[in-house]
């Protein structure tokens, strides 16, 4: 069950819940946003204060890391399995250092299995964080510091830090280096969402959340 199921079962308070996949005993702890946009959102990524190192290995991005109450990555394997069982939407919520907020909403999101390096698939972009997708389309394989699956000679994950669906290297990286206020401009390896804030701006906060499309 995901956060949408948790919500429907009567738990309507934000917080960390234990989720499971259908036909599986494997459990994962995730933060559920039960308030935003009707609730039922499973948070798959959060950046807010730089407390967690996101320059991690393939295996760490596969199983997840961090603290579900704070900064964390839920795990590519869980997200892949979840998003291949039914149709999910992806909402990416962004905060800058000047108090502005924006979002990108994709009406269909899923990750391929590990066989294809958790390649990202996205359709139907709306929202305020840019009319063009800052995640390259068609989607690319996921890369980490020890798994160079991008399309650049430069090894994007090592150069820009963090695991992401790099192209060569592409217009976004929400898992880049966390830079504090007044150190967040002209940073090529920061937390980037190009079609909202440009190439050198490193964001204050990001949340990636998913929910079944028929919620």
């Amino acid at each position: 069950r995901d956060c949408a199921e948790v919500f429907k079962s009567g738990h309507t308070t934000n917080g960390v819940y234990t989720l499971t996949l259908p036909n599986s005993t494997e459990e994962v702890k995730a933060y559920c946003d039960m308030e935003a946009g009707g609730g039922g959102w499973t948070i798959i990524q959060r950046r807010e204060d730089g407390s967690v190192d996101f320059q991690r290995t393939w295996k760490e991005y596969k199983v997840g890391f961090g603290n579900p109450s704070g900064e964390y990555w839920l795990g590519n394997e869980f997200v892949s399995q979840l998003t291949n069982q039914q149709r999910y939407v992806l909402k990416i919520h962004l905060k800058d250092w000047e108090g502005n907020e924006a979002y990108s909403l994709y009406e269909h999101f899923y990750l391929s299995s590990e066989e294809l390096n958790y390649r990202i698939h996205l359709k139907g972009l709306t929202g305020t964080a840019g009319k063009i997708s800052s995640i390259s389309q068609p989607g690319n394989d996921f890369s980490t510091k020890d798994a160079d699956n991008d399309k650049c000679i430069c090894k994007c994950s090592q150069m820009l830090t963090g695991g992401w669906w790099f192209d060569a290297c592409g217009p976004s990286n929400l898992n880049g280096m966390y830079y504090p206020q007044r150190q967040n401009t002209n940073k090529f390896n920061g937390i980037k969402w190009y079609y909202w804030k440009g190439s050198g701006y490193s964001l204050k906060g990001t949340t990636m959340m998913i929910r079944p499309a028929d919620f």
């Epitope: 393939w58 590990e114 294809l116 394989d141 020890d146 798994a147 160079d148 399309k151």
Partner: antibody, heavy 120, light 107 residues
Framework: QVQLVESGGDVVQPGRSLRLSCAAS????????MHWVRQAPGKGLEWVAI????????YYADSVKGRFTISRDNSKNTLYLQMNSLRVEDTAVYSC?????????????WGQGTLVTVSS | DIQMTQSPSSLSASVGDRVTITCRAS??????LAWFQQKPGKAPKSLIY???NLQSGVPSQFSGSGSGTDYTLTISSLQPEDFATYYC?????????FGQGTRLEIK
């Protein structure tokens, strides 16, 4: 420099088994995925199988699935291909190739190959 | 499976010529394309990956381009050592598949 040296090729009868080896040197073997690719006499290249850097994932071409098994011993810097239930159409030069990363599905270095002939 | 079709299947050219080999995929492969060179009795040599990235040590007369289903390998000025067979390879999905090869001969 990167070196990949295959061995174990032989002439065998249909239905029999054979194990190929690929000895790797000049790089950190345990950090790279590895592939087997084959080339039938006078024909083009055919991908056979991949094994991830740590042996956690293995994928095969349909033509060999269920008959061939790819494996590796990172302590010995060696890649293997166990070939069972061999068929005449498996006759080819078998080469190992290093994946560009742990799982990128493209190659940067190849071995010279070892010839497998399946004939009655 | 994704079919890769190379053209021409063979080509005669002279030293100094500019040569283009094309590769067409049966479906879009989002630039997950590599090129190899093979000489008789030798191991294939990797030239290009991700459509246009030169492998380390590959001379700059080689270049690649393309998108979607159509890709090209260009040799800007043929050198004597460039006469060989060239293969394209898609790695967008499994199974990994190759083109049938283009044999480049001396005119």
């Amino acid at each position: 420099q990167v070196q990949l040296v295959e061995s174990g090729g032989d002439v065998v009868q249909p239905g029999r088994s054979l194990r190929l080896s690929c000895a790797a040197s000049g790089f950190t073997f345990s950090s790279y995925g590895m592939h087997w690719v084959r080339q039938a006499p006078g024909k083009g290249l055919e991908w056979v199988a991949i094994i991830w850097y740590d042996g956690s994932n293995k994928y095969y071409a349909d033509s060999v699935k269920g008959r061939f098994t790819i494996s590796r011993d990172n302590s010995k810097n060696t890649l293997y291909l166990q070939m069972n239930s061999l068929r005449v159409e498996d006759t080819a030069v078998y080469s190992c190739a290093r994946d560009f990363s742990i799982s990128s599905r493209h190659f940067d270095y190849w071995g010279q190959g070892t010839l497998v002939t399946v004939s009655s | 499976d994704i079919q890769m079709t190379q053209s021409p299947s063979s080509l005669s050219a002279s030293v100094g010529d500019r040569v283009t080999i094309t590769c067409r995929a049966s479906q879009a492969i989002n630039n997950y394309l590599a090129w190899f060179q093979q000489k008789p009795g030798k191991a294939p040599k990797s030239l290009i990956y991700a459509t246009s990235n030169l492998q380390s040590g590959v001379p700059s007369q080689f270049s690649g381009s393309g998108s979607g289903t159509d890709y090209t390998l260009t040799i800007s000025s043929l050198q004597p050592e460039d006469f060989a067979t060239y293969y394209c390879q898609q790695y967008y999905i499994y199974p990994i598949t190759f083109g049938q090869g283009t044999r480049l001969e001396i005119k």
